[in-house]
């Protein structure tokens, strides 16, 4: 008789999850000399230890701290790019502007990017059938708590001018319920961070509105100002041209507004 298994509303653990995490770790440590000392088997053991045999709706930040410890990484604190609902462009940008870093350019972010995982209470099995959905099941699930933990630490490490890329095509350009809005904004350290600069990315080619005047951006400005951090905002009207100009800043067309 097959053992009863909890059915969650979200997709199950990504297939070949252990192999993927281990392979990504090896690849990352080969590419990044400053992380060559990392023992990827130990990293996987700590990752696994965070959620295996634990109820997937009862995961805490504490569970991930051993993984955080092994994945501790120093990135230039004044070169941090946060993003919300516009991951692909943010990653394209840091692939060109190599001295800037998103969370997914760090070891721990890279390991988990686009993956899903969860276990089952009191068994050492990984659940490949289903995992809790943040809205329909529970917020304290392995994936959500992981991203909350690494995002908090990433924001805490930031200094000087911090940039954030926001999606101007969304109804809420700044969303208080996003990871950026609920975690990162509140963990920027006012004694280290001077300014948060928002880049609002326009979607339509003919969109010439000043999205920095959007009510949700004003809300972000208010939150940031109350935390004694300065706020500035720029419209990126042509994201394609923006990326092109990051690649070739001396191009004559790059002096005009993008």
């Amino acid at each position: 008789v097959p053992r009863w298994r909890q059915q969650w509303s979200g997709p199950g653990t990504t297939k070949r999850f252990p192999e993927t995490v281990l392979a990504r770790c090896v690849k990352y440590t080969e590419i990044h000399p400053e992380m060559r000392h990392v023992d990827c088997q130990s990293v996987w053991d700590a990752f696994k230890g965070a959620f295996i045999s634990k109820h997937p709706c009862n995961i805490t930040e504490e569970d991930y701290q051993p993984l955080m410890k092994l994945g501790t990484q120093t990135v230039p604190c004044n070169k941090i790019l946060l993003w919300s609902r516009i991951k692909d462009l943010a990653h394209q940008f840091t692939q060109v502007q190599r001295d800037m870093f998103t969370l997914e350019d760090t070891l721990l972010g890279y390991l988990a990017d686009d993956l899903t995982w969860c276990g089952e209470f009191n068994t050492s099995k990984i659940n490949y059938q289903s995992c809790p959905d943040w809205r329909k099941d529970c917020s304290n699930n392995p994936v959500s708590v992981f991203w909350k933990t690494v995002s908090r630490r990433f924001a805490e490490a930031a200094c000087d001018v911090v940039h954030v890329m926001l999606n101007g095509s969304r109804s809420k350009i700044f969303d208080k319920n996003s990871t950026f809005g609920s975690v990162e904004v509140h963990n920027l350290q006012p004694e280290k961070v001077q300014t948060l600069e928002a880049w609002v990315i326009h979607g339509g080619r003919e969109d010439s509105r000043d999205l920095c005047q959007d009510p949700t951006i004003k809300e972000l400005e208010s939150i940031i100002s109350k935390r004694n951090i300065q706020f500035s905002c720029k419209n990126i009207y042509r994201p394609d041209k923006f990326l092109q100009c990051v690649k070739n800043p001396e191009d004559s067309s790059c002096t005009s507004e993008i």
Epitope: D39, S42, A46, E62, Q65, P66, K69, L70
Partner: antibody, heavy 119, light 107 residues
Framework: EVQLLESGGDLVQPGGSLRLSCGAS????????MSWVRQAPGKGLEWVAD????????WYADSVKGRFTISRDNSENTLYLQMNSLRAEDTAVYYC????????????WGHGTTVTVSS | QSVLTQAPSASGTPGQRVTISCSGS??????VSWYQQLPGTAPKLLIY???ERPSGVPDRFSASKSGTSASLAISGLQSEDEADYYC??????????FGGGTKLTVL
């Protein structure tokens, strides 16, 4: 029976060196992070150093960084603490402790070995 | 200077309930453990993972954690509970840190 047994404590002059050992028995030594913790006379507990299960990662308190080295030999079930450039303030009872599942707590402690740094 | 703060002393009479507290910002995101050190002996784990008791520890010992503070409660105080009690957790650098210790006297 789960046991940790420290040895190697001694009276040593300032600037001298000492190597502490901790033998483990009754559990799978190679599965666990291990720590050294010290206690100066009449004072509280102070964490000194940690080592990961496979020995590939080590961490140190600022007060001993660059002077002490934690290591382990999983084939011999033994934990070590190499102490160099010893100072009077390193005088303490040194305990080795087994970490329960990384950060749950230190569930097994040795009886301690005394290090005295004095001229 | 420890980043976990404990009162240096506490006291109670036999049968009483006493509470020992521990506070520090790192408690918020890290597990807390509690240790009992009887005079002249090595520390012994009393509580792990915030509130769980290892087998063999009497259920007179309980613990809780909320935000940046944690507490250990001992009910039905006995003379053999006279000892030093230490809290511990990982700090913001994810290294172990101990509280300064609380000396419990049974009056």
């Amino acid at each position: 029976e789960v046991q940790l047994l420290e040895s190697g404590g001694d009276l040593v002059q300032p600037g001298g060196s000492l190597r502490l050992s901790c033998g483990a028995s009754g559990f799978t030594f190679s599965d666990h992070y291990m720590s050294w913790v010290r206690q100066a006379p009449g004072k509280g507990l102070e964490w000194v150093a940690d080592i990961s299960a496979r020995g590939s990662n080590t961490w140190y308190a600022d007060s001993v960084k660059g002077r002490f080295t934690i290591s382990r030999d999983n084939s011999e079930n033994t934990l070590y603490l190499q102490m160099n450039s010893l100072r009077a303030e390193d005088t303490a009872v040194y305990y080795c402790a087994k970490n329960w599942n990384y950060n749950y707590g230190m569930d097994v402690w040795g009886h301690g070995t005394t290090v005295t740094v004095s001229s | 200077q420890s980043v976990l703060t404990q009162a240096p002393s506490a006291s109670g009479t036999p049968g009483q309930r006493v509470t020992i507290s521990c506070s520090g910002s790192s408690i918020q995101n890290n597990y807390v453990s509690w240790y009992q050190q009887l005079p002249g002996t090595a520390p012994k784990l009393l509580i792990y993972r915030n509130f769980e008791r290892p087998s063999g520890v009497p259920d007179r010992f309980s613990a809780s954690k909320s935000g940046t503070s944690a507490s250990l409660a001992i009910s039905g105080l006995q003379s053999e509970d006279e000892a030093d009690y230490y809290c511990a957790s990982w700090d913001d650098s994810l290294n172990w840190v101990f509280g300064g210790g609380t000396k419990l006297t049974v009056l």
